[in-house]
Interface confidence: low
């Protein structure tokens, strides 16, 4: 339906609190460098304007689109040219080009560093003094670091953050209560950000069809009792919601997500038996709960897949009449029967099935041609299965840190041109697949691992796209979304790589290393390992083990010394010389 004033419509639907939060997120995701106070001022102005439009929808400018209104407001920022350079040129454009321009300038790696949590008492004082400001600051800090964060979900995490402080600021030992809860929330937020980034990349780089295929597979696994038509409706709505959020239309996105949650809860009987608990919750929690809900049980007596997709004499007729719908039903039927498969694997099987029908339906005897199509799936299923088995065994043998280092070596040898910080970040994330998935029951490992790896490799693709340095990375990232992981897995050592010149600077360490938290200490060591490999790409596992062992001893020795800085200055060059000799 058309509304006289779009901004009034969204304000009424969302309510002031959520409206304010979403506008703050939108501004923070677009203007990532601006101070919090500047954003608060803009949000207040937009909110007051919206209230005016609610009171009188025919008031001046109330008929303008949200992009026009929010874009005009962004373009009033005085420091735009100084802080953002050419992004200021976006303001010369008219909508919709202006919004597209802003989107292109979003920075996936703004370099603000991890959000540091100040001391517990200070946090609780700030929380009690001005709860709204405290939570607004949280939204701002997350949004500017994660410019594609799923906005309505970020509002949910802000509520969870509020809950943590409400509880812990009353506790006897505030820090003991806060630290584990804030850390656990940080992990969830980072995971949520990375997942949404993959959804946005899928929509932006591979189109709506790719996103819908992914969603059909995922929802069919979660809601195997739902009919195909029901799944299709949910997928269409979901595609609209994520297109909006990925496109910066956060108010529409949040409003549509709330509508979808309402629809799902009103139609639980035809979707899933597991939704009752979710549907009693308030809107943000309800949507979050639905997105995380456990899988429903499979309906009894499902016929074998072959009946409709191999044995039916009408296979080619059905396929040629409505290719997307027929392939959609194949993906739906296969996915609901295989909750243990990763979405990526299910999509590869659907692609293989499509390729077989394309080939066979053009022959004289199609049924004979596609009779054994399911046998052609075996290697596609075995490849990720073996990969997960091998890597989980390696993880169990080495532990998380050792497993990360093995992956660092593997990926640096595959794509040595990639920057050291990116290789370290991505390999550390890849290495977390062990503790995240290898501890699962056998039946859940594959889907957990491969779908998690897709999310992590998307991060590599996003970072690499910003500063492309490797044709191999570009190829794996752009050729096929579902084959990204197999593409990276298949990469061998890059024999064309010219080793990096040795630089003593890279291997110079100081006493500040000793006071770093464990994770940051690991990052320093892992960065040194990457640099070592870039200098000596042919180094053997044994040589690397020796050098890294020596490095660990060197750090331990100097951090235990009376005069730490003197020790680093004296022992550092010796270590470098020894390392060069060991790798000669």
């Amino acid at each position: 339906e058309a509304h006289q004033s779009e901004i009034a419509h969204r304000f009424n639907d969302l309510g002031e609190e959520h409206f304010r939060g979403l506008v703050l997120v939108a501004f923070s995701q677009y203007l990532q460098q601006c101070p919090f106070e500047d954003h608060v001022k803009l949000v207040n102005e937009v909110t007051e304007f919206a209230k005016g439009c609610v009171a009188d929808q025919s008031a001046a400018n109330c008929e303008k689109s949200l992009h026009e209104l929010l874009g005009d407001k962004l373009c009033t920022v005085a420091s735009l040219r100084d802080k953002y350079g050419e992004m200021a040129d976006c303001c010369e454009k008219k909508e919709p080009e202006r919004n597209e321009c802003f989107l292109q300038h979003k920075d996936d790696n703004p370099g603000f560093g991890q959000l540091v949590t100040p001391e517990a008492d200070a946090m609780c004082t700030a929380f009690h003094e001005n709860e709204q400001r405290f939570l607004g600051k949280y939204l701002y800090e997350i949004a500017r670091r994660h410019p594609y964060f799923y906005a309505p979900e970020l509002l949910y995490y802000a509520e969870e953050y509020k809950g943590v402080f409400t509880e812990c600021c009353e506790a006897a030992d505030k820090a003991a209560c806060l630290t584990p809860k804030v850390d656990a929330l940080r992990e969830k937020v980072l995971a949520s950000s990375a997942k949404e980034r993959l959804k946005c990349a899928s929509l932006q780089k591979f189109g709506e069809r790719a996103f819908k295929a992914w969603s059909v597979a995922r929802l069919s696994q979660k809601f195997p009792k739902a009919e195909f038509a029901e799944i299709s409706k949910l997928v269409t709505d979901l595609a609209k919601i994520h297109k909006e959020c990925c496109h910066g239309d956060l108010l529409e996105c949040a409003d549509d997500r709330a509508d979808l949650a309402k629809y799902i809860c009103e139609n639980q009987d035809s979707i899933s038996t597991k939704l009752k608990e979710c549907c009693g919750k308030p809107v943000l929690e309800k949507s979050h709960c639905i997105s995380e809900v456990e899988r429903d049980e499979l309906p009894a007596d499902l016929p074998p897949l072959a009946v409709d997709f191999v044995e039916d004499k009408e296979v080619c007729k059905n396929y040629q009449e409505a290719k997307d719908v027929f392939l959609g039903t194949f993906l739906y039927e296969y996915s609901r029967r295989h909750p243990e498969y990763s979405v990526s694997l299910l999509l590869r099987l659907a692609k293989e099935y499509e390729a077989t029908l394309e080939k066979c339906c053009a022959t004289d005897d199609p049924p004979a041609c596609y009779a054994h199509v399911f046998d052609e799936f075996k290697p596609l299923v075995e490849e990720p299965h073996n990969l997960v088995k091998t890597n989980c065994e390696l993880f169990e043998k080495l532990g998380e840190y050792g497993f990360q280092n093995a992956l660092l070596v593997r990926y640096t040898k595959k794509v040595p041109q990639v920057s050291t910080p990116t290789l370290v970040e991505v390999s550390r994330s890849l290495g977390k697949v062990g503790s995240k998935c290898c501890t699962h029951p056998e039946a859940e490992r594959l889907s957990c691992a491969e779908d998690y790896l897709s999310v992590v490799l998307n991060r590599l693709c996003v970072l690499h796209e910003k500063t492309p340095v490797s044709e191999r990375v570009t190829k794996c990232c752009t050729e096929s979304l579902v084959n990204r992981r197999p593409c990276f897995s298949a990469l061998q050592v890059d024999e064309t790589y010219v080793p990096k010149e040795f630089s003593a600077e890279t291997f110079t360490f100081h006493a500040d290393l000793c006071t770093l938290p464990e994770a940051e200490k690991q990052i320093k060591k892992q960065s040194a390992l990457v640099e070592l490999l870039k200098h000596k790409p042919k180094a053997t596992e044994e040589q690397l083990k020796t050098v890294m062992g020596d490095f660990g001893s060197f750090v331990d020795k100097c951090c235990a010394a009376e005069d730490k800085e003197a020790c680093f200055a004296e022992e550092g060059p010796k270590l470098v010389a020894a390392a060069q000799a060991a790798l000669a």
């Epitope: 929690e285 979050h288 709960c289 456990e294 501890t439 699962h440």
Partner: nanobody
Framework: QVQLQESGGRLVQAEDSLRLSCAAS????????MGWFRQAPGKEREFVAA????????DYVDSVKGRFFISRDIAKSTVYLQMNNLKPEDTAVYYC?????????????????????WGQGTQVTVSS
């Protein structure tokens, strides 16, 4: 009401591996966080490891991190504790425990306290 039955405990040498199992029966297993605890002679019962109701998040006491792995098989209503590189100080009676899930999210952490249901225990002895 949930009934829990541990098995798999025995006498092993230091550095050996052992896998403990805990079979659950009764109320729906899927809606419970599961944990392993242990009690050495003359000491208080201590938390070892826990896994949340969906098997997605785990928690370990520092002394067993990297050596022990907790997992669950929802279809078989069983939780496992894979113990590698055992040490004499791991000698204890190991108890399996269950508690109502701590959160609606499958990523909600399992927690170390508030367990309502307990098994009888299984003895693990590690000799040097």
């Amino acid at each position: 009401q949930v009934q829990l039955q541990e098995s798999g405990g025995r006498l092993v040498q230091a550095e050996d591996s052992l896998r403990l199992s805990c079979a659950a029966s009764g109320r729906t297993f899927v809606s419970y966080d599961m944990g392993w605890f242990r009690q050495a002679p003359g000491k208080e019962r201590e938390f070892v490891a826990a896994i949340n109701w969906r098997g997605y998040t785990t928690d370990y006491v520092d002394s067993v991190k990297g050596r022990f792995f907790i997992s669950r098989d929802i279809a078989k209503s069983t939780v496992y504790l894979q113990m590698n590189n055992l040490k004499p100080e791991d000698t204890a009676v190991y108890y399996c425990a269950a508690r109502q899930m701590s959160g609606s999210s499958r990523y909600s952490p399992p927690g170390r306290v508030g367990y309502d249901f307990w098994g009888q225990g299984t003895q693990v002895t590690v000799s040097s």
